[in-house]
Amino acid sequence: IPTEIPTSALVKETLALLSTHRTLLIANETLRIPVPVHKNHQLCTEEIFQGIGTLESQTVQGGTVERLFKNLSLIKKYIDGQKKKCGEERRRVNQFLDYLQEFLGVMNTEWIIES
Amino acid sequence: IPTEIPTSALVKETLALLSTHRTLLIANETLRIPVPVHKNHQLCTEEIFQGIGTLESQTVQGGTVERLFKNLSLIKKYIDGQKKKCGEERRRVNQFLDYLQEFLGVMNTEWIIES
């Protein structure tokens, strides 16, 4: 019997829930939520989850929309755990430079960079 | 005449400088710097630049190694600017949900997720 279902599966399910409950969530016509103006999503996790909190407080709870917010809260928990792991291990300069090079390489190839 | 060199060019130059000055940078055998234990680099920008600060304070300055740290500081400035843009614009719920869906989609396909 599996001991844990991976976060990737949680994300997939959450996408399906989000798609289903979209109509209910957009019912509030007056609500405004901060939306990042670029696509480097990982830089904006704090603001994204603040927005989710705002949305949750303004949404009529009950039934399966609760499940969506539960999943989103578990995703936040996962990301918070990842953030904790940013500074946990102290290594030699060599290993730090490997990581820095990798970070810049990813920035070079994958980030959406405007001047 | 161009008014600004794009960040993408700055990143490319920095990668080259990093490669050139690696030997000088790893000269300090005793120095230990926090290194993230996962590859979701954008979540760790704060810790990465703290590490760069530590490294700079322990590195003999002069010549082109100074250029490397200047570039890294400009990259930090760019990222700080991007982080500011995470919460600047308030939009309708619909647009927030588009961004959230995109974020989860990216998480689903591009993040390195361990259970």
Epitope: I5, L10, G63, T64, R67, K70, N71, L74 | -
Partner: nanobody
Framework: QVQLQESGGGLVQPGGSLRLSCAAS????????MSWVRQAPGKGLEWVSS????????YYEDSVKGRFTISRDNANNTLYLQMNSLKSEDTALYHC????????????WGQGTQVTVSS
């Protein structure tokens, strides 16, 4: 104690159908959201489909949409997965799962039933 017991798996040819069942006991079945997850040989667990406690909302992973149908019978504490147009990539051990605790995701699941799609 909580028990989830799957059945209905087997060997089927591509394009064929199967109906999986999951008998639940030890908790108030009708109060809980239920799901099917699967694990293909050498792969990680994958979410397949979910259903709300009253059965009014159903959700599917993109690759099974239009081919699989999840349903439940709250009177008999049973969860179902009707699988049509089966493909070789559906070969996996299928588990039904639920979560009884607020801060966890699928904390209870069954032993699983094996589905093999092969000609």
């Amino acid at each position: 104690q909580v028990q989830l017991q799957e059945s209905g798996g087997g060997l089927v040819q591509p394009g064929g159908s199967l109906r999986l069942s999951c008998a639940a006991s030890g908790f108030t079945f009708s109060n809980y959201y239920m799901s099917w997850v699967r694990q293909a040989p050498g792969k990680g667990l994958e979410w397949v489909s979910s259903i709300s406690s009253d059965g009014s909302n159903t959700y599917y992973e993109d690759s099974v949409k239009g081919r699989f149908t999840i349903s439940r019978d709250n009177a008999n504490n049973t969860l179902y997965l009707q699988m049509n147009s089966l493909k070789s990539e559906d070969t996996a051990l299928y588990h039904c799962a639920t979560d009884l605790y607020d801060d966890s995701w699928y904390d209870h699941w069954g032993q699983g039933t094996q589905v093999t799609v092969s000609s």
